[in-house]
Amino acid sequence: EEELQMIQPEKLLLVTVGKTATLHCTVTSLLPVGPVLWFRGVGPGRELIYNQKEGHFPRVTTVSDLTKRNNMDFSIRISSITPADVGTYYCVKFRKGSPENVEFKSGPGTEMALGAKPS
C-alpha cells in the first residue's frame, strides 16, 4: 500500500490584490481516511483557511469536486486577495481519531506573496 504524500507543487505564488489565487494540493492515496484542511502558518497560532469537513469559508472554493469518492485534488481558490492574505499556506491531511482527528501529514507549503501590479 502506497504511503500517502501531500503534493504542493508551487513553493512561491505571486498574486495580485483583488484577484483570485489558486493554491494547489493533491494527495497520492485515499488512505488513511480523514479530512484535509488548509492552514496559513504553522504551530498553535496557525489560521484555518479551509476545512473539508465543516465550516463556512466565503472566500474559498474548491477546484475539484470534493464529494467524489475517489477525489485526490484538494486545491482551493481564494478570491479578492488583500495584502493581509500573504503568508505560507499548508495543505494538511488528518487521520480520523477519537475524540479528535490527528494530524497525519502536511504538504511542504506554498508561500503567497504580492506581485507587482500590472502597469
Partner: antibody, heavy 117, light 107 residues
Framework: DVQLVESGGGVVRPGESLRLSCAVS????????MSWVRQAPGKGLEWVSG???????YYVDSVKGRFTISRDNSKNTLYLQVNSLTAEDTAIYYC???????????WGLGTLVTVSS | ALTQPASVSADLGETVKITCSGG??????YGWYQQKSPGSAPVTVI????ERPSDIPSRFSGSASGSTATLTITGVRVEDEAIYYC???????????FGAGTTLTVL
C-alpha cells in the same frame, strides 16, 4: 428543514423498468453527494448507488449495468433509473444525503418497488 | 461484511452498547441508523464514528477503535426500542456497507 421525498415506485413485471425520483428541499442540493439505499421485505439495508455533486457515479456490483443514478441540480432532484428488474429488486428504495465522508445524515420516507409476474 | 449482534435487551434506564465489527478503522468511517419498524424511514443517530446530528438526544454516542465500532445509549428509554444498523464507508472500495441490524428491546 431538510426534506427528501421519493416517488416513482410501483408494481412491475420482471424485465420492466421504472424511474425513481427524490425531490429535496431545505439545503443546497448541488453541494452534496447523494445515495440510494434499498430494503427488501424482512431484510436489512443495502446501499445501491451514489452520485457526487458533480455527477460522478458509483454502484453496488449487483446493479451495475442495470441501474443508472443521475441528478438535476436545477430541479433539486435525484433519480434512479432501474431497468431489467427482477424479483430480487423488490424493496423500499430510500434516497439519502451523504455527509462529507460518504455516510448518511438524512433519509427520505422511501418508495416501494414490487417486481412480480 | 459488518457483524453486529442480532438482538440486545436492556432494562429501562440502563446503559446499552451495540457493537459492529469487521472493518478496518484506517479505511472506514462508521455510522449508526435507527429504524423504529421495518419499512419505516431510517434515522441517523451517529455518523463519522462519533458525531451526533443536532436533533438526536445526547444519550446516543458512538466510538470506533481498531476493527470495532460501538453505539452506546446511556439511560435507555422505551422510545429507543428499534432496529439499529451500523454502516460503513470503505475508502478503499468506494462502497457503503451495512450490518444485518440489531434489535434493541427495552425491558
Amino acid at each position: 428543514d431538510v426534506q427528501l421525498v421519493e416517488s416513482g415506485g410501483g408494481v412491475v413485471r420482471p424485465g420492466e423498468s421504472l424511474r425513481l425520483s427524490c425531490a429535496v428541499s431545505g439545503f443546497r442540493f448541488s453541494s452534496y453527494a447523494m445515495s440510494w439505499v434499498r430494503q427488501a421485505p424482512g431484510k436489512g439495508l443495502e446501499w445501491v448507488s451514489g452520485i457526487s455533486s458533480g455527477g460522478d457515479t458509483y454502484y453496488v456490483d449487483s446493479v451495475k449495468g442495470r441501474f443508472t443514478i443521475s441528478r438535476d441540480n436545477s430541479k433539486n432532484t435525484l433519480y434512479l433509473q432501474v431497468n431489467s428488474l427482477t424479483a430480487e429488486d423488490t424493496a423500499i428504495y430510500y434516497c439519502a444525503r451523504e455527509t462529507w465522508n460518504h455516510l448518511f445524515d438524512y433519509w427520505g420516507l422511501g418508495t416501494l418497488v414490487t417486481v412480480s409476474s | 461484511a459488518l457483524t453486529q449482534p442480532a438482538s440486545v435487551s436492556a432494562d429501562l434506564g440502563e446503559t446499552v452498547k451495540i457493537t459492529c465489527s469487521g472493518g478496518d478503522s484506517s479505511s472506514h468511517y462508521y455510522g449508526w441508523y435507527q429504524q423504529k419498524s421495518p419499512g419505516s424511514a431510517p434515522v441517523t443517530v451517529i455518523y463519522s464514528d462519533d458525531e451526533r446530528p443536532s436533533d438526536i438526544p445526547s444519550r446516543f454516542s458512538g466510538s470506533a477503535s481498531g476493527s470495532t465500532a460501538t453505539l452506546t445509549i446511556t439511560g435507555v428509554r422505551v422510545e429507543d426500542e428499534a432496529i439499529y444498523y451500523c454502516g460503513a464507508y470503505d475508502g478503499s472500495t468506494y462502497a457503503n456497507t451495512f450490518g444485518a441490524g440489531t434489535t434493541l428491546t427495552v425491558l
